[in-house]
């Protein structure tokens, strides 16, 4: 019998470069077997990861994987920083690698990041 853990697929040192003022969706790829786990986002602040309980989140279900999405509408300069998603599974807590947002303030941006850069998804796409 194969093990059936909840799994979080954020790679080591994943990062996104984004513009303040734009909308952005930060995705946590989650794989689970039967019941969808309770997943949350938190933002690293010193030695703690502060839960983002009042932020808009949603699920996107695909064939082999699901995505727990943290919405930024719009991105603010102070959204800069590192985030983790975490899941509660059979009374175990699993936490993803951190994913870092580099926010460029439009006022100080000399040029807009490329389309490729904006669309880049350093987390692992499940195929």
């Amino acid at each position: 019998k194969e093990s059936c853990d909840v799994q979080l697929y954020i790679k080591r040192q994943s990062e996104h470069s984004i513009l303040a003022g734009d909308p952005f969706e930060l995705e946590c790829p989650v794989k689970y077997c039967a019941n969808r786990p309770h997943v949350t986002w938190c933002k690293l602040n010193g030695t703690t990861c502060v839960k983002l309980e009042d932020r808009q989140t949603s699920w996107k279900e695909e064939k082999n994987i699901s995505f727990f999405i943290l919405h930024f509408e719009p991105v603010l300069p102070n959204d800069n920083g590192s985030y983790r998603c975490s899941a509660n599974f059979q009374s175990n807590l699993i936490e993803s690698h951190s994913t870092t947002l580099y926010v460029t303030d439009v006022k100080s941006a000399s040029e807009r990041p490329s389309k490729d850069e904006m669309a880049s998804r350093p987390w692992l796409l499940y195929r």
Epitope: K1, E2, Y9, Q13, K31, T47, I94, L124, R127
Partner: antibody
Framework: QVQLKESGPGLVAPSQSLSITCTVS????????VNWVRQPPGKGLEWLGM???????DYNSALKSRLSINKDNSKSQVFLKMNSLQTDDTARYYC????????????WGQGTSVTVSS | SIVMTQTPKFLLVSAGDRVTITCKAS??????VAWYQQKPGQSPKLLIY???NRYTGVPDRFTGSGYGTDFTFTISTVQAEDLAVYFC????????FGGGTKLEIK
């Protein structure tokens, strides 16, 4: 239950290449990453690289030019290939499964001993 | 790559003693640190992850702590079966291990 088992040649001549297979059971390679770690006799552990669920790879930068990691999901096998072996590549080679969050290695094989000698 | 400096290299202790091993990272690794135990002739076994979380089935005499660059692994009351080499490992980026601490029992 979760198991990983390495199989290799045992003895490799200097300048030749090394191929090791890690056969896993109790979990699917479409769900977990697998790492390769080696340990020279009486020494510490050195991470070589890993293969993610989609087949993409990460390598130890110092060994990247000599390493290749692949897998066959249907056969539940992960393959390590290392080129241009020298005597200091003599070590025990382990495969190890990533935890579900990718932040530690929770199951290890028993390792396969590789000696580089003429 | 991140260097994990582990001290001491050797520990000779009596059963019942308290043991502390430290690991210092060359840059901040958040809490992305694991500790492993390798008994003679065996493969490594995961003891601690997220710097302080005990892995399933690991006795509570094993504890870990730390954040950023400084990490500590403690065995509160050493037992004879704890004879092993202990390794720290960072997983913040390309994984690296400490050099190991060989624990010997008097």
């Amino acid at each position: 239950q979760v198991q990983l088992k390495e199989s290799g040649p045992g003895l490799v001549a200097p300048s030749q290449s090394l191929s090791i297979t890690c056969t896993v059971s109790g979990f699917s390679l479409t769900g977990y990453g697998v790492n390769w770690v080696r340990q020279p006799p009486g020494k510490g552990l050195e991470w070589l690289g890993m293969i993610w669920i989609d087949g993409s790879t990460d390598y130890n930068s110092a060994l990247k030019s000599r390493l290749s990691i692949n897998k066959d999901n249907s056969k539940s096998q992960v393959f390590l290939k290392m080129n241009s072996l020298q005597t200091d590549d003599t070590a025990r080679y382990y495969c190890a499964r990533d935890r579900p969050d990718g932040r530690a290695m929770d199951y290890w094989g028993q390792g396969t001993s590789v000696t580089v000698s003429s | 790559s991140i260097v994990m400096t582990q001290t001491p290299k050797f520990l000779l202790v009596s059963a019942g003693d308290r043991v502390t091993i430290t690991c210092k990272a060359s840059q901040s690794v958040s809490n992305d640190v694991a500790w492993y135990q390798q008994k003679p002739g065996q493969s490594p076994k995961l003891l601690i992850y997220y710097a302080s979380n005990r892995y399933t089935g690991v006795p509570d005499r094993f504890t870990g702590s730390g954040y950023g660059t400084d990490f500590t692994f403690t065995i509160s009351t050493v037992q004879a079966e704890d004879l092993a080499v202990y390794f720290c490992q960072q997983d913040y980026n390309s994984p690296t291990f400490g050099g190991g601490t060989k624990l010997e029992i008097k």
